[in-house]
Amino acid sequence: SEVEYRAEVGQNAYLPCFYTPAAPGNLVPVCWGKGACPVFECGNVVLRTDERDVNYWTSRYWLNGDFRKGDVSLTIENVTLADSGIYCCRIQIPGIMNDEKFNLKLVIKPAKVTPAPTRQRDFTAAFPRMLTTRGHGPAETQTLGSLPDINLTQISTLANELRDSRLANDLRDSGATIRIG
């Protein structure tokens, strides 16, 4: 089933999705939609990129990572319970007929009334391994034979341990770099 990601009401939620461009600037269109990935494209589109830039977005939805390097992870600002549900990240590889599509489940929890604990800084312990969307084991890279200039890293999830959005925010804030592929 879909990997679950969690955030609290009022926080920013983080839904990871990545691919590896063949070269900097050689981008692949990506869409994000609310709801499971349809047969084609994305339904209820909240954000879309083209070969150059983010060309469509709606309020509260943005890409915080470097999408020019293939980090098309979605940030949803100031979430409410209504933001719970499935989100579709679709990497629209040109020239072949099978887009990479990933369904990610966002669970919004009511805000805690107790003070937040000290922020986690030991990312080695918190982030011991990568996961792939299909299959098991280390991150796998699929080279698309019909499109030799694109390497698609089949990763839509960072790790089981990275399902709480606060930890994702910590990881991003720390400037830690995750090499994929």
Epitope: A36, C37, V39, F40, G43, K101, N103, R134
Partner: antibody
């Protein structure tokens, strides 16, 4: 609501070319994806291919050398052409669209026979 | 192509009863499964998408479940209008492929 209606001949001779039309109301074929699916007498359903908002097409590899899907945006119609038909192409042909193939025409039944 | 093996090919059940139809994909289709009802003279009707999401306007007597390669479809409290042929569809990979169909009859 999107409505689709197939039209075309009910009988075609072997080796001839089949041409079908799908007339669309309630949406513009300059948006979304427009598909053809057929159902054989034994109840098997086969996905044939699509034409999308930009005019890009995909054809099922099993039909690739014989199939063509085109469109006329001014008429809001799209078309299926199948060359060199045989009796194996006897089927009911449906035009289909929607996020999860929500909208289907009623189908047009084609018999290939000499 | 991803072959979809659907069973049974036909079944007969009592009004008010329950039926289950299964589809097995040759490979993991990541829950990208739809279920359709087909009656003669009409186009197929979408019942369920993404394995278990009920299409708008479809009664809750219909349900779906599954993951990986194995998927199932249930009808509870069978009614006369449920007489039809039912199909699964995988839309994870092109060319999309359908199950072989299950013809449902009421006893």
């Amino acid at each position: 609501e999107v409505q689709l209606q197939e039209s075309g001949p009910s009988l075609v001779k072997p080796s001839q070319t089949l041409s079908l039309t799908c007339s669309v109301t309630g949406d513009s074929i300059a948006s979304a994806y427009w598909n053809w699916i057929r159902k054989f007498p034994g109840n098997k359903l086969e996905y044939m291919g699509y034409i999308n908002y930009s005019g890009s097409t995909y054809y099922n590899p099993s039909l690739k050398s014989r199939i063509s899907i085109t469109r006329d945006t001014s008429q809001n119609q799209y078309y299926l052409q199948l060359n060199s038909v045989t009796t194996e192409d006897t089927a009911t042909y449906y035009c289909v669209t929607g996020d999860y193939f929500d909208y289907w025409g009623r189908g047009t039944t084609l018999t290939v026979s000499s | 192509d991803i072959q979809m093996t659907q069973s049974p090919s036909s079944l007969s059940a009592y009004l008010g009863g329950k039926v289950t139809i299964t589809c097995k994909a040759r490979q993991d289709v990541r829950k990208n499964i739809g279920w359709y009802q087909h009656k003669p003279g009409k186009g197929p009707r979408l019942l369920i998408w993404y394995t278990s999401t009920l299409q708008s306007g479809i009664p809750s007597r219909f349900s779906g479940s599954g993951s990986g390669r194995d998927y199932s479809f249930n009808i509870n409290n069978l009614e006369p209008e449920d007489i039809a042929t039912y199909y699964c569809l995988q839309y994870d990979n092109l060319p999309f492929t359908f199950g072989t169909g299950t013809k449902l009859e009421i006893r």
